[in-house]
Amino acid sequence: NYANGKNNVPRLKLSYKEMLESNNVITFNGLANSSSYHTFLLDEERSRLYVGAKDHIFSFNLVNIKDFQKIVWPVSYTRRDECKWAGKDILKECANFIKVLEAYNQTHLYACGTGAFHPICTYIEVGHHPEDNIFKLQDSHFENGRGKSPYDPKLLTASLLIDGELYSGTAADFMGRDFAIFRTLGHHHPIRTEQHDSRWLNDPRFISAHLIPESDNPEDDKVYFFFRENAIDGEHSGKATHARIGQICKNDFGGHRSLVNKWTTFLKARLICSVPGPNGIDTHFDELQDVFLMNSKDPKNPIVYGVFTTSSNIFKGSAVCMYSMSDVRRVFLGPYAHRDGPNYQWVPYQGRVPYPRPGTCPSKTFGGFDSTKDLPDDVITFARSHPAMYNPVFPINNRPIMIKTDVNYQFTQIVVDRVDAEDGQYDVMFIGTDVGTVLKVVSVPKETWHDLEEILLEEMTVFREPTTISAMELSTKQQQLYIGSTAGVAQLPLHRCDIYGKACAECCLARDPYCAWDGSSCSRYFPTAKRRTRRQDIRNGDPLTHCSDLQHHDNHHGPSLEERIIYGVENSSTFLECSPKSQRALVYWQFQRRNEDRKEEIRMGDHIIRTEQGLLLRSLQKKDSGNYLCHAVEHGFMQTLLKVTLEVIDTEHLEELLHKDDDGDGSKIKEMSSSMTPSQKVWYRDFMQLINHPNLNTMDEFCEQVWKRDRKQRRQRPGHSQGSSNKWKHMQESKKGRNRRTHEFERAPRSV
């Protein structure tokens, strides 16, 4: 089925130009002396988005990011020179790239930057209340940023600041070799993962850190780190990457005799995101790119959304996998990975696991110990040598919820919004790519709510140039999405119901949980508004069922039929442009001969070729004159988008017209034109103008001029016979909807 084959293409594909023209994107295109707008901190209370960039920290107004404040925080000449002397790139590396931006308390943020390969941190005052309008750097108080921000701007930090303590996963050295998970700030001694032990961390790249409660007792709270790292030798043949989830207890203060100032509760497990292959070999998406936690009613059990890409340079693909925290906990309570046997392979540990079980937080809940410093030596020894779990964490339903392998881009970021619709709750995913586009995807149940199907609603280009989307935040309060890249920051609404069209069917076909037909337009759906006229069908997107009683209404309020006249010359070619707004729609053409009511389906062949943009008619004949109707069919619903009247001029007329006397006085034309009716004379005069006019390149421009002149004449001579004006009647009616021959994206929003 052709329509089903189109299911994995975005229904709407909007270029940056179209996004701008329809006011669907606001962009901050960066400052000349800055870049790398990668570090986001959303503050819904103050209605601000804080963004860390190169040498700057910004505070954007969530309502409109064009309204912003900025702090300039560059490095000194000293630091810049030192960095340059170390052989680093003065523009790309020897600057202060902000990597950490966290809320420190009610009045301050904590920020850290690379400091030109000399990490540095400070506090930023933001005031008690939004109306304070304070945004200033505490330049009297700088702190060493080692173990908080990486030295190298190419590396990321996963950070989390809770109760005055900063948890960060980063590289702690100049060379970018000593990767660790740290806890700094606060009143306790800094704590980190074991150094120079590849069993703990093996060249990791940190993605994010999250606090997730384990029980109702805050003492059991854990911090989870998401990262990817090199698989340990023996774990995989050849060099491979594994996606990981790591845990540490919030109340871990290190060991007493061993693992002093090192984590004693660190454990990690592999995150699997794969699809079964034809030969029984799974295709793995191992390169974890981003993670989003969707909070549920139970704070202990958020849903984890992960974006993954393939490691292979040959096969490029992306996937989204969903994980449940109960599955994660099950793995952390399962067998530890242990190296044993003649081949020194990784096997599940079969021996006695010391008590209390390594990875358990010291608390009243699970008994016995008040502090990790009181843990028995055998627990510490075991924890040191068994940081990894044997079993991996599999995604919900054991497969990705979305895969993209047939495209020239890869996924980089994800945020998810839970939307209440007429028939239930839907998760809408906004996925950022490495080419500066955002995909809007909805998970729709097929037979059951467990068996989900992904519907790609829109693909939106949010930056002028292709650029990797490196940060995304979603404001539920503002119903806006904020996107970061090297080039700048973009803001777009989560829903733009009016772009789908002016008819119930179009609104229904969109399958956007945010939108519903309210009786007169496609608008934001609010579950609280109990109106029987609300029409919405996310599960099936079936307009025939939901809008059938409104068809008359639709015809009245729906898009008016676009009509055009096109002139073609016999034996030449002409192109009839018609492409529906929806990429899921099938285009269906009909032909109606002049003075006939009967419409026939156009058969494709050498003479008529169908393209994505429309119909190409080659070697025009007189019999091709007539009406061409372009229809869009989607989900059983058909809509007529365009009626083109084609007039074919025969070559005889044209040759006579072009063949001038030898002496070039054009007497033949005079002679020929004398036998014509007044309207014919006007028409031929206009046609000659087109042929001889050096500045009129296209039929369109010619027609435009005739149309303007015609209108002017009518204004000047009211009540007069209008001569050839009927010829251009359709043209006037459809002028706004006309497209240029060059197929630039200058069209008004198309129907369907």
Epitope: Y77, T78, D81, W85, D173
Partner: antibody, heavy 116, light 110 residues
């Protein structure tokens, strides 16, 4: 007041080794890159080596590469230069200098004489 | 042979203005900051000018630095007898990945 005090110089045979030290005070030592610069008797200044504030990176002049090793101990506020396979042309006053985009503070120097 | 070229000597009478030149290439002076160092007889060098033309605190404003293209110069106005010293220019050399000094200029106050 910034102070840099070199020690460890002296007379050594060709092919021998020597370890120079530089004790720093009056500034946050662990925050700055440090360097060694030498001056042969009656000659001009020659940069020898420099080390990043956290020892993360070390750089050497071609004339000493592979023979000299720069290091530092931030807990002791001390900079070191381990000199091996010494040659007659290494004879010079060795200055320890604080790096601040240039050499903004210098020690008084320690004389190293390599005799054949 | 030094990478940066300075005249071996310069002289002037008290109160006079003296200029010492330093020429290099695009890999050092052309693209990096120039510093000037003063070395009084029997003492360690002292930073006189940094970042082409800036004076550290404590250095009299009689000393000024400038740079044009791949050349730099140090000007001393109102010359005094205590200015008699060796003067070195220095800059980072990107192609050598090292710091380079001029051969030094011995300034004599007549």
């Amino acid at each position: 007041e910034v102070q840099l005090l070199e020690s460890g110089g002296g007379l050594v045979q060709t092919g021998g080794s020597l370890r120079l030290s530089c004790a720093a005070s009056g500034f946050t030592f662990s925050d700055y890159a440090m360097s060694w610069v030498r001056q042969a008797p009656g000659k001009g200044l020659e940069w020898v080596s420099w080390i990043y504030y956290d020892s993360g990176s070390k750089y050497y002049a071609d004339s000493v590469k592979g023979r000299f090793t720069i290091s530092r101990d931030n807990s002791k506020n001390t900079l070191y230069l381990q000199m091996n396979s010494l040659r007659a042309e290494d004879t010079a006053v060795y200055y320890c200098a604080k790096l601040n985009g240039d050499f903004d503070y210098w020690g008084q120097g320690t004389l190293v004489t390599v005799s054949s | 042979q030094s990478v940066l070229t300075q005249p071996p000597s310069a002289s002037g009478t008290p109160g006079q203005r003296v200029t010492i030149s330093c020429s290099g290439s695009s890999s050092n002076i052309g693209n990096n900051d120039v510093s000037w160092y003063q070395q009084l007889p029997g003492t360690a060098p002292k930073l006189l000018i940094y970042a082409d033309s800036h004076r550290p605190s404590g250095v009299p404003d009689r000393f000024s630095g400038s740079k044009s293209g791949t050349s730099a110069s140090l000007a001393i106005s109102g010359l005094r007898s205590e200015d008699e010293a060796d003067y070195y220019c220095g800059a980072w050399d990107s192609s050598l990945s090292g710091y380079v000094f001029g051969g030094g200029t011995k300034l004599t106050v007549l």
